[in-house]
Every structure is written in structure tokens, then in C-alpha cells.
Interface confidence: low
């Protein structure tokens, strides 16, 4: 499919002028290359009418140009004093006409509208409301006023001052006639259809002597704006439809065949299956715009857009529109990356973010698709090192592999964790990615105990288990803080027993803490990686007590599932007292409701949310 | 390119009220976070109050809760901070950023930023 995208459909009137933009993939070969407009003949060739190289044919000469913005990967062909000749078939392309690097482009150029003398032109937007303003003399001014429409040869009444009303107008048209100071009457049309256009005639009393004034009333369907965006990236539709209907329902709906227009999204809770988990409806302003990110751009979401307003959430005759043709670009310069990463219970995942490599000093953001409320994604991460409260401990950005690519690890897995999360940046806005997060059946791969407890100025050893499918992988242990996991020295024990049907391959690594401190306290993690590649991780609290006996304490997987005060033996280890402790996260909601992003002079910021859900603190 | 523009300083009274506003060009406007931040003469630039993108959360510095109110119209491109029962210790320069997807206190991720407009409360 040709990554060239431009207009399907222009349509204009003798003598007016059209601006045609064609979009390119800004590669340096497209750059560069040639453009150029070219009629298609009855024979199926091309005919150059203006290129970038400075031809101009003898039909284009002194009423048409083409500009080349490299920059925004566009070119724009300018035709002005337009006749019903140019009606036709054309391609807007790059390099040479015949290679197929080409959008094919219909010009319409009608004539313009015959209009009887005194005619008063109303051009209106599709949806919109128009007043037709009739004047009348004094000795019309107690006679009947009426308002007809020509259909055909024939005028046929729309509306009159004794209150008949045509039944295609019901519920929509008024007619109101102003002050006895002012000799005027108006007759008001709300939501415009396309078949409202055409030629009226306002009447002031029936005689000889009545009053007349015709009108032709122009329904404008929106002009579609071409949107050009990547393959697995992300496009806004910004929507603003005028405070008329800021209190109505609004949507976002995608034309499929024929009239028909497909909810995608609207503010009365409706969203389409496809696109659950990549769409947000941000909040309407008081004036009724609002705006619709897409992200997770998908080869079959191309085509064209509506957004409205309408009481049942969805396009109806006489809705207020705007419309886009949206074109995903196959050529995309977004890498492929994971859309569905598999956890579970008690496991972690390790999700890949790309991100623009020319934006490398960006902040890197991860946050949770919210479907409530027309979708949200409130933050859990940052690359500046703020981490979502309850998620302290098991979550961690780090900037590895780099180039182009961030990492995020979530651990301690529960069914909660379900869900679709996006990938992003304060750079590029278009560089928003989607990755789905399932919870399935299994054992967790990678074995620790439970919640520890460490005493002061003593030694501790924390156990790991690996498996063999890990035996070529690097495995480390690191203390995880908000802005990362900091690795620390461990030991290889040998091999584990902590698998069945698992041979030498398998592995004990151990963490020692000598002559343990209140600093020691906290999260660590357990892991594997391939370079900067980062697999499974799983997490233990380390919780420090004030001495009680002297020794050292070596912690074993059977004793991190007993119970307070509870003596287990296990081969291999001496046997241990093991003070359980509750898991920090249970906290979490208890902690002061405060973002401790600290300033440099020390004060403190809070925060406010739409969400009960985001009332947890955060840590810097 | 956004560009920021802040209005609606001047000189009140304690206990008066401001508006300020901050006008932004550039259709991105929408898709980024807004804040505004302070510098009062010889201190270090304070964040002050921030809105996200969507709206849905708003940041506030301890000490003006209550009292300010940081709001947004994405259709003019424009945040306003609404400041009651001003302070003398308020007196500052007040700027506009802009550029993140999240609202925060660190100055960090704003990369766009307004010049500045003056707001001074006297006792």
C-alpha cells in the first residue's frame, strides 16, 4: 500500500481556488525526491501538471504552484481560477508518476449556484442553526408571514405566523417577529440537513402588495482534515462544536459503509470493543469541545472520523459535525513491541516502551487505562523517580536498553493487575504505546521467602531460587528505591532444591546483608537479565528489629510462609525464629494523602483527584 | 513550538483576589500538563499549583490550598490561576509552564515556560 496520503474527494466552484495537501513518510530519500500533480487519462497514464522541479504545464500556467515542507512531510499543490474543465481524476505522488508512490485524488468543480437578483446567500455548516432575516413594508405588518422552499417548480410552505409548521421542520424551526419598532421577521433553523439547502422565499401578506425576499440556504458538509500518523502510534482528534451544545451528549464515531457511522466513543459511556484500552475521552471544557486520543494505531483504524453531538450519543440528521480521514502509515518509524505481556499470580512481567531515540533526556512515563468516566490514565511511574504509593516495591522504570527503548517491571502480581497500560513521554505526543497486561495460571518462576526480618548489627542471607530454563541468564539482587533497583554483590550456593525435575542447571543465588542497619530495611529484588534485558523479578521486604540474641540469620523458603513465632527446620539451614511482618502495602492507603514531590527550599505539594483511587501518597 | 504568555498581575491588597492567565499557542496545548510556578526576589523558583492534561487531577503547594485554584479551557488554550485571601508572603513573579503529561512539582518535566507576570500584595 503507497505511505502517500492525501484528499480522496475535492469539491469547489468555477472560479474559486482549492489547496490540495499530500502527506509523505519525511524520510531524506522523500525529502528530497521529486513531487509531483499529474491528471490521470481515459488510458490509464498520468499526465505531469506541476512538479517540484519547476515544470508547469501551458493548462496550469499562472494560476497554479506546489510547495515541497520537508520538514512536515507534506507538499501543497495551489490551483486558483478554477473552471468545470478541471473536474477529474488526478494523483498527487513522489518520484516518477508511473512507480505507484502515488494517492489518487478526485477534483469536482461545479457551477456555481444560478441566483435570482436579491438574493441573499446564508452558508451554514451542517448541524448548525440559521436565521433567515425578511424585511417587510408598514402595510404588511398585521398581514401573515410565511416562508416557503422551492421544491422543483413549486413553492411549498415551511412555516407561517398562524402557526403551521411543514412536518420535515418539526421540532427544529421558529419564527419570530421582531419589536413594532423593527420591520423584520426571522425565521430560525436549528441542526441543518443537507437536504435543507436549496432556495426559499420569505413572504409578508398574500395580495399584490405582500412583501417578498429570497434566499438560498448552503449546507456545508465539514470538509474532512487529513490526519497522517504512524502504525503503532497515536493521533488526537480535537473536537469543538460551539457552546450550543455544550450540554449535549457528544461522540466519536468512524463511517463504515454507506451513511452508517460507528460509535467509537461517547460521553454516555459507550466505547467500541477495538478500541478498549487505547482510547481516552478527555473531559469537555464549558464551551463543549473536548478532544479523543487513539493510541495503538492499528492498519484498520484508517478512514474517516466524525465527532458530534447528539442527546443519544451517536451521529443523527442535523448533529453539529467535524470530520477527519485519518491514514495510518504501514512505513512506520514506531518499532514493534509486545501489545499483550503474560504474567502470573505472585510473578512479574517486564514490559518494553519505545520511545522516540532523537527525545532520550524525555521523561518516561507509565500509567493505567482507566475505562470509567470515557477512559483515564492516571500515573504509577516516572523516570524522575515518583512512584504511585501503592505500588512501592514492586514497580520500577529504568531507562535501560536505552536507544530508543525504556524498561518497566512490575512484580507481586495479583489478578489486579490486569489491564492495559500506556507507555510514554513528554516528547513526542505521538510516540503513546499500549501494552496489555493478562494474569494467567502458573507458579511463579523465580522462588524467595516471604517477608523478612533482619537484626541490627547482624548478618543476613537472603535466599533465591532460579530454575534451570534461567541457567544462561545473568541473575543479580538489587535494592529497589523510587528511582530504580540498585544491584548489589550475591553468591552462587549452587544448586537448588527447591525444583522438581529441574537438573543441576537450577540455581540458589543469596544476598548478604553483613552487620545490618535501619538502612538495610526495605524492598529487594531478586532477577534475571540478557544485557540490558530484563526478565522475571521477585520482590522481599526486609524488615530491621533491635538485636534480641546474637548470631547470624539465613532466611529459607520454608520459613517464609510460617507463622509468627512458628520454628521450622529446613535442610541446610539453622533453625530460625521468624517474626512475619505485614506487608508495607497495606499501608499504603494509610500514608498521609500528600505528592511528596519536595521542592528545593522543602515545601510540599498535595494532591487533588477526580478518583478516590489516586488518593494514595507518593514517594520521591 | 508552544509559546506562553501569563496576564492578570498587578498590585492589591492583602486579602484581595487575582486572576491570572496564561495563554499558549500551539494545538498540542491540550495534550500537555500546566503549571504554575513562583519567584519571589533572592529565592529559588517554587512550583505553585498544576492541572493534567485531561483535568482530572490538580497539585497544589500546601501553603496556598484552599486559596488558589488552578483551572483550564482547552478550546482557548489557556490555564488560569484564581488566587483569594492573598498574602504578602504571595508577592512573587508568577510563571506559566507547560510540556508535561503529568502534573507534578518538579520543574523538571515543563519544558516550556512564559516570561513571567508580577503579582505584588501589600500589607
Known amino acids: 500500500k503507497s505511505p502517500i496520503f492525501g484528499p480522496e474527494e475535492v469539491n469547489s466552484v468555477e472560479g474559486n481556488s482549492v489547496s490540495i495537501t499530500c502527506y509523505y513518510p519525511p524520510t531524506s530519500v522523500n525529502r528530497h525526491t521529486r513531487k509531483y500533480w499529474c491528471r490521470q487519462g481515459a488510458r490509464g497514464g498520468c499526465i505531469t501538471l506541476i512538479s517540484s522541479e519547476g515544470y508547469v504545464s501551458s493548462k496550469y500556467a499562472g494560476r497554479a504552484n506546489l510547495t515541497n515542507f520537508p520538514e512536515n512531510g507534506t507538499f501543497v499543490v495551489n490551483i486558483a481560477q478554477l473552471s468545470q474543465d478541471d473536474s477529474g481524476r488526478y494523483k498527487c505522488g513522489l518520484g516518477i508518476n508511473s512507480r505507484g508512490l502515488s494517492f489518487d485524488v478526485s477534483l469536482e468543480v461545479s457551477q456555481g449556484p444560478g441566483l435570482l437578483n436579491d438574493t441573499k446567500v446564508y452558508t451554514v455548516d451542517l448541524g448548525r442553526t440559521v436565521t433567515i432575516n425578511c424585511p417587510f413594508k408598514t402595510e404588511n405588518a398585521q398581514k401573515r408571514k410565511s416562508l416557503y422552499k422551492q421544491i422543483g417548480l413549486y413553492p411549498v410552505l415551511v412555516i407561517d405566523s398562524s402557526g403551521y409548521v411543514n412536518p420535515n421542520y418539526t421540532g427544529r424551526i421558529r419564527l419570530d417577529i421582531q419589536g413594532t419598532g423593527q420591520l423584520l421577521f426571522s425565521v430560525v433553523i436549528n441542526q441543518l440537513r443537507l437536504s435543507d439547502a436549496g432556495q426559499y422565499l420569505c413572504q409578508a401578506g398574500d395580495d399584490s402588495n405582500s412583501n417578498k425576499k429570497n434566499a438560498d440556504l448552503q449546507v456545508l458538509k465539514p470538509e474532512p482534515e487529513l490526519v497522517y500518523e504512524d502504525l503503532r502510534g497515536s493521533v488526537t482528534f480535537h473536537c469543538a462544536l460551539g457552546p450550543e451544545v455544550a450540554n449535549v451528549a457528544k461522540f466519536l464515531c468512524r463511517q463504515s459503509s454507506g451513511e452508517n457511522c460507528d460509535v467509537v466513543v461517547n460521553t454516555l459511556g459507550k466505547r467500541a470493543p477495538a478500541f478498549e484500552g487505547r482510547i481516552l475521552l478527555n473531559p469537555q471544557d464549558k464551551d463543549g469541545s473536548f478532544s479523543v486520543v487513539i493510541t495503538g494505531l492499528r492498519k484498520e483504524d484508517a478512514g474517516r472520523y466524525l465527532c458530534g453531538a447528539h442527546s443519544d450519543g451517536q451521529l443523527q440528521e442535523g448533529s453539529p459535525i467535524q470530520a477527519w480521514q485519518l491514514f495510518v502509515n504501514e512505513e512506520s518509524t514506531i518499532p514493534r513491541s509486545p501489545t499483550v505481556v503474560k504474567g502470573v499470580a505472585g510473578g512479574s512481567v517486564a514490559v518494553l516502551c519505545p520511545y522516540n531515540r532523537k527525545e532520550s533526556k524525555s521523561i518516561k512515563y507509565w500509567c493505567l487505562w482507566e475505562g470509567a468516566q470515557n477512559g483515564r490514565c492516571p500515573l504509577l511511574v516516572d523516570s524522575e523517580g515518583w512512584v504511585k504509593a501503592q505500588y512501592e516495591g514492586r514497580l520500577s522504570l529504568l531507562e535501560e536498553p536505552g536507544n530508543g527503548t525504556f524498561t518497566v517491571i512490575l512484580n507481586q502480581l495479583t489478578s489486579r493487575d490486569a489491564g492495559f497500560y500506556w507507555c510514554l513521554t513528554n516528547g513526542d505526543t505521538l510516540w503513546r504505546t499500549t501494552v496489555e497486561i493478562k494474569i494467567i495460571e502458573g507458579e511463579p518462576n523465580l522462588k524467595v521467602p516471604g517477608n523478612v526480618t533482619a537484626v541490627l548489627g547482624e548478618t543476613l542471607k537472603v535466599p533465591c531460587h532460579f530454575p534451570c530454563k534461567f541457567s544462561s541468564y545473568e541473575k543479580y539482587w538489587c535494592k529497589w528505591n523510587n528511582t530504580g533497583c540498585q544491584a548489589l554483590p550475591s553468591q552462587d550456593e549452587g544448586p537448588s532444591k527447591a525444583f522438581v525435575n529441574c537438573d543441576e542447571n537450577s540455581r540458589l543465588v543469596s544476598l548478604t546483608l553483613n552487620l545490618v542497619t535501619r538502612a538495610d530495611e526495605g524492598w529487594y529484588w531478586c532477577g534475571v537479565k540478557q544485557g540490558h534485558f530484563y526478565g522475571e523479578t521477585a520482590a522481599v521486604y526486609v524488615a530491621v528489629e533491635e538485636r534480641k540474641a546474637a548470631g547470624s540469620r539465613d532466611v529459607s523458603l520454608a520459613k517464609a510462609d510460617a507463622a509468627p513465632d512458628e520454628k521450622v527446620l529446613d535442610s541446610g539451614f539453622r533453625e530460625i525464629e521468624n517474626k512475619a511482618i505485614q506487608d508495607p502495602r497495606l499501608f499504603a492507603e494509610e500514608k498521609a494523602v500528600a505528592d511528596t514531590r519536595d521542592q528545593a527550599d522543602g515545601s510540599r505539594a498535595s494532591v487533588d483527584s477526580g478518583s478516590s483511587e489516586e488518593q494514595g501518597g507518593s514517594s520521591r | 513550538e508552544v509559546q506562553l504568555v501569563e496576564s492578570g498581575g498587578g498590585l492589591v491588597q492583602a486579602g484581595d483576589s487575582l486572576r491570572l492567565s496564561c495563554a499558549a499557542s500551539?494545538?498540542?496545548?491540550?495534550?500537555?500538563?500546566m503549571a504554575w510556578f513562583r519567584q519571589a526576589p533572592g529565592k529559588d523558583r517554587e512550583f505553585v499549583a498544576a492541572?493534567?492534561?485531561?483535568?482530572?487531577?490538580?497539585y497544589y503547594l500546601d501553603s496556598v490550598k484552599g486559596r488558589f485554584t488552578i483551572s483550564r479551557d482547552n478550546a482557548k488554550n489557556t490555564v488560569f490561576l484564581q488566587m483569594n485571601s492573598l498574602k504578602p508572603e504571595d508577592t512573587a513573579v508568577y510563571y506559566c509552564?507547560?510540556?508535561?503529561?503529568?502534573?507534578?512539582?518538579?520543574?523538571?518535566?515543563?519544558?516550556?515556560w512564559g516570561q513571567g507576570t508580577q503579582v505584588t500584595v501589600s500589607s
Open positions: 492541572i493534567s492534561w485531561s483535568s482530572d487531577m490538580t
Open positions: 500551539g494545538r498540542t496545548f491540550s495534550t500537555y500538563a
Open positions: 509552564a507547560s510540556g508535561a503529561y503529568y502534573a507534578g512539582s518538579s520543574t523538571s518535566p515543563y519544558n516550556y
